[in-house]
């Protein structure tokens, strides 16, 4: 058993039929010694008396809010949550496996630049009695500070018969060094509590590996005289790190016909313009990637050819 | 050229070669996303590699103030990785494919280090750790880790030279 936060405790249980469970001793937080009784949740049934209460925790029916009283007055509370371990593996019932970029990916994170700011998100089908707490650090043995905000519900989607909820959190490395080569990964830890079930999820990454620039901005076409060719121009996204002579991007320009089956013409360039042939009913799209490190491409910015 | 006395390197040449190094490092080990190397333990094997750290002056302002600190750090790293790529980690079993970019990568590391430090000048270089994995699978894992680490190193070096070529060239 360990303390998650003040008056909230997590009991770690091996979860299998007829498991013996864990013996837990609760202590009433009071100077009083006599006349103390214990109850669980809303029940008025007295579970025991005295300053301490010993219980055998085997299942969710044994978890909940234990309260010690004296003469009708509440003295203190202890909330017990369960963390299940099945076949040596901690349960992951609360969050959905996003399966990208690999199986058992529960947390996904992205950064728009090298400033030390990143966003992580996760999915669940649970809609109520759900809380998340996020902690992060750079490295684990001698951790350096990363500040995370509150996790917020960022999207709701219908998936078949189920509703899916996306939560996200923003974090910022306290003393980020955008130009340095990272040697210690960022660690992100999410505590998830659904009713009386506790689970924790972790992710470890370098900012450089989760970089995904915003799409190029101000995408424009300039027809060239007496030609089917056009000059496409664009700018670096506002949110990309500066100066651009140091934090450079490379770009992919694509000409795509109306039909998905039509051949796509692609040009790669380090410049912020390119000359391409604009076909009727086609569109021109541009996306960006770090020039020197192959992290994710941005989403496409597009304009119609006409 | 960046000599210990403090004259300027051939920024544009260094920029071109460092960008080529980035391309080679990724073509030598493209499938990085499919293997989370941090989960493979064995941290001590790559802990000793030289990293370009916050105080090394490789940020835009540090380069403007005095690029020598940064260039010396990059030079140390290039020599270190050049030695690693020439060691039995890469020359031993399992053999690299004949058209593997590792050979080109090795030569380009040497080329860039020589651009930074011509014959007759000596910056102190970092000792290469004695890594001699006994099993072929250990060697393979170590190659992945070294190449992964090299990708991050040459990305920073390429940014430095690109910025230098754009803002510090005479």
């Amino acid at each position: 058993i360990w303390e998650l936060k003040k008056d909230v405790y997590v009991v770690e249980l091996d979860w299998y039929p007829d498991a013996p469970g864990e013996m837990v001793v609760l202590t009433c937080d009071t100077p009083e010694e006599d006349g103390i009784t214990w109850t669980l949740d809303q029940s008025s049934e007295v579970l025991g008396s005295g300053k301490t209460l010993t219980i055998q925790v085997k299942e969710f029916g044994d978890a909940g809010q234990y309260t010690c009283h004296k003469g009708g007055e509440v003295l203190s509370h202890s909330l017990l949550l369960l963390h299940k371990k099945e076949d040596g593996i901690w349960s992951t019932d609360i969050l959905k496996d996003q399966k990208e970029p690999k199986n058992k990916t529960f947390l996904r994170c992205e950064a728009k630049n090298y400033s030390g700011r990143f966003t992580c998100w996760w999915l669940t089908t649970i809609s109520t009695d759900l809380t998340f707490s996020v902690k992060s650090s750079r490295g684990s043995s001698d951790p350096q500070g990363v500040t995370c905000g509150a996790a917020t519900l960022s999207a709701e989607r219908v998936r078949g018969d189920n509703k899916e909820y996306e939560y996200s959190v923003e974090c910022q490395e306290d003393s980020a060094c955008p130009a340095a080569e990272e040697s210690l990964p960022i660690e992100v830890m999410v505590d998830a509590v659904h009713k009386l079930k506790y689970e924790n999820y972790t992710s470890s990454f370098f900012i450089r590996d989760i970089i995904k620039p915003d799409p190029p901005k101000n995408l424009q076409l300039k027809p060239l005289k007496n030609s089917r060719q056009v000059e496409v121009s664009w700018e670096y996204p506002d949110t990309w790190s500066t100066p651009h002579s140091y934090f450079s991007l490379t770009f992919c320009v694509q000409v795509q016909g109306k039909s998905k089956r039509e051949k796509k013409d692609r040009v790669f360039t380090d410049k912020t313009s390119a000359t391409v042939i604009c076909r009727k009913n086609a569109s021109i799209s541009v996306r960006a990637q770090d020039r020197y490190y192959s992290s994710s491409w941005s989403e496409w910015a597009s304009v119609p050819c006409s | 050229r960046a000599v210990p006395g403090g004259s300027s390197p051939a920024w544009t040449q260094c920029q071109q070669l460092s960008q080529k190094l980035c391309t080679l490092a990724w073509s030598a080990h493209p499938l990085v996303g499919h293997m989370d190397l941090r989960e493979e333990g064995d941290e001590e094997t790559t802990n000793d590699v030289p990293h370009i750290q916050c105080g090394d002056g490789c940020d835009p302002q540090g380069l403007r103030d005095n690029s020598q600190f940064c260039l010396q750090r990059i030079h140390q790293g290039l020599i270190f990785y050049e030695k690693l790529l020439g060691s039995d980690i890469f020359t031993g079993e399992p053999s690299l494919l004949p058209d593997s970019p590792v050979g080109q990568l090795h030569a380009s590391l040497l080329g860039l280090s020589q651009l930074l430090q011509p014959e007759g000048h000596h910056w102190e270089t970092q000792q290469i750790p004695s890594l001699s994995p006994s099993q072929p699978w250990q060697r393979l894992l170590l190659r992945f880790k070294i190449l992964r680490s090299l990708q991050a190193f040459v990305a920073v070096a390429a940014r430095v030279f690109a910025h230098g070529a754009a803002t510090l060239s005479p």
Epitope: G116, G149, E170, D214, T239, T242, F247 | R64
Partner: antibody, heavy 120, light 107 residues
């Protein structure tokens, strides 16, 4: 073109409340941290509060902590400052500002400001 | 909290002069410092961010330098439109703090 337009200022008695709004246009509002800065008549600039792009993290100057609340509605491209328990020393022009390049804290773009006067 | 000091608090100069304003922080803020210009009745305007980066559209006669605790704003040839109050701001950590300002007026 980036535009920030503050509103909601005015005369209020000590102990009263006001809610300032800042309507943003010309950029993707949900992608940027935002701040409020104030300037008392004839005095220098004082940072008041900041909010991250998602709204999930907020920070306040000690002088307003517990009395002011910063919030944002990304669907309406609007930043808010709820000011309670106002004091005479809160009298100032309040500016909203968009934070800057590559996630930096630089206050890159500013509105023209709205005047809050706390007086009986 | 990080305290910011600026010197001088005011200065008189003529068009064409080279003007230097310094800003000092009570603890290191790396390069996380900006310089702002404010004219009476107007909102402040960012001139320099990240200690030395010139904000787009700002004339090149403005330049910034320094790191850690000591920073400088230089106006290489003062123009009539440059008479204003200048503030530095550290955005290294919350709470962000401004310097008290330097008023540049006509000699």
């Amino acid at each position: 073109e980036v535009q920030l337009l503050e509103s909601g200022g005015g005369l209020v008695q000590p102990g009263g409340s006001l809610r300032l709004s800042c309507a943003a246009s010309g950029f993707t509002f949900s992608g940027y941290d935002m701040s409020w800065v104030r300037q008392a008549p004839g005095k220098g600039l004082e940072w008041v509060s900041s909010i991250w792009s998602s709204g999930g993290y907020t920070k306040y100057a000690d002088s307003v902590k517990g009395r002011f609340t910063i919030s944002r509605d990304n669907s309406k491209n609007t930043l808010y400052l709820q000011m309670n328990s106002l004091r005479a020393e809160d009298t100032a022009v309040y500016y909203c500002a968009r934070q800057g390049v590559g996630g930096s804290g630089s206050l890159l773009y500013w509105g023209q400001g709205t005047l809050v006067t706390v007086s009986s | 909290d990080i305290q910011m000091t600026q010197s001088p608090s005011s200065l008189s100069a003529s068009v064409g002069d080279r003007v230097t304003i310094t800003c000092r922080s009570s603890q290191g803020v790396r390069y996380d410092l900006g310089w702002y210009q404010q004219k009476p009745g107007k909102a402040p305007k960012l001139l320099i961010y990240g200690a030395f980066n010139l904000q787009g559209g700002v004339p090149s006669r403005f330049s910034g330098s320094g790191s850690g605790t000591d920073f400088t704003l230089t106006i290489s040839g003062l123009q009539p439109e440059d008479f204003a109050t200048y503030y530095c701001l550290q955005d290294f950590q919350y709470p962000f703090t401004f310097g008290p300002g330097t008023k540049v007026d006509v000699k």
